[in-house]
Interface confidence: low
């Protein structure tokens, strides 16, 4: 699998992974003890033709253009977890691996 990586200075208009640091404290999510912030990343950009399309099905559906189908969207195609220390609803401190918190790769789907 292949995915583009960009930054805020990039002129790339196609689907790309951009850096984004999520600050839990800024959100008021104080029930998260650690990490207070982490690199989450995000996907943005255009999905034209077969560029970065994860599945052949995406291209075929777009070509067939059935009623109600939208074009492919730039979306995470690979994600990874992070380890977090947090309070649950019962005030207990939990340490756990939270899935799909980091975007590793973006594609058109």
């Amino acid at each position: 699998d292949f995915g583009l990586d960009c930054d805020e200075h990039s002129t790339e208009s196609r689907c790309c992974r951009y850096p984004l640091t999520v600050d839990f404290e800024a959100f008021g999510w104080d029930w998260i003890i650690a990490p207070k912030r982490y690199k989450a990343n995000y996907c943005s950009g255009e999905c034209e033709f077969v560029f970065l399309q994860k599945y052949p099905h995406t291209h075929l559906v777009h070509q067939a253009n059935p009623r109600g189908s939208a074009g492919p969207c730039c979306t995470p195609t690979k994600m990874s977890p992070i380890n977090m220390l947090y309070f649950n609803g019962k005030e207990q401190i939990i340490y756990g691996k939270i899935p799909a918190m980091v975007v590793d790769r973006c594609g058109c789907s």
């Epitope: 404290e25 800024a26 959100f27 008021g28 999510w29 029930w31």
Partner: antibody, heavy 119, light 107 residues
């Protein structure tokens, strides 16, 4: 158990200043947003200010901005509200509250302290 | 700023009655709403968070529902200790705002 003990209220003349304190115990203070809320005599509750766990982000009610300053001392588990240029309409019971962020909101409250602004 | 409109402002009810209090937000606040009980001369006490979750130690006769702009606090069978004022609060973002309060009195 969670405790929030307030102090610092009293009678003050218009234009005067007062500093309210809220001493926290029974929980990990430096992982919680803290708030001040007030209640004028016979009126409803009014949110005053919030400060996030490490003091990075501070929020005030638009009507109070510039006169009131919220702060915290995580080393001593304390929350403060410095009130300057006090007006008669600031007369109220002031409550501190512990806040569990945008997911849970305030849960525990201090006992309240009365601030009377009068000449 | 978001306005929270709470109704009724007061109501009279008897022990055992089912009581419903409503809070309406002027815009979508998802489920970021809490309900608080306050007795005269006392601090507010948390009842409900996230619109429908019961704070620990709160009796199950209290329940909350709703999301978006319409929220309800229900007391399924009013007890003598439930006569108090109830406040809703939106905490979706700042500035936060309370409803005007609902005083529940003995009929």
């Amino acid at each position: 158990q969670v405790q929030l003990v307030q102090s610092g209220g009293g009678l003050v003349k218009p234009g005067g200043s007062l500093r309210l304190s809220c001493a926290a115990s029974g929980f990990i203070f430096n992982t919680y947003t803290m708030n001040w809320v007030r209640q004028a005599p016979g009126k409803g509750l009014e949110w005053v200010s919030s400060i996030t766990s490490r003091g990075t982000y501070i929020f005030y009610s638009d009507s109070l901005k510039g006169r009131f300053t919220i702060s915290r001392d995580n080393a001593n588990n304390s929350l403060f509200l410095q009130m300057n240029s006090l007006r008669v309409e600031d007369t109220a019971v002031y409550y501190c509250s512990r806040d569990r962020g945008y997911t849970f909101g305030p849960d525990y409250w201090g006992q309240g302290t009365l601030v009377t602004v009068s000449s | 700023d978001i306005q929270m409109t709470q109704s009724p402002s007061s109501l009279s009810a008897s022990v055992g009655d089912r009581v419903t209090i409503t809070c309406r937000a002027s815009q979508d606040i998802r489920n970021d709403l809490g309900w608080y009980q306050q007795k005269p001369g006392k601090a507010p006490k948390g009842l409900i968070y996230a619109a429908s979750s019961l704070q620990s130690g709160v009796p199950s006769r209290f329940s909350g529902s709703g999301s978006g702009t319409e929220f309800t606090l229900t007391i399924s069978s009013l007890q003598p200790e439930d006569f108090a004022t109830y406040h809703c609060l939106h905490y979706d973002f700042h500035p936060r705002t309370f409803g005007q309060g609902t005083k529940v009195e003995i009929k």
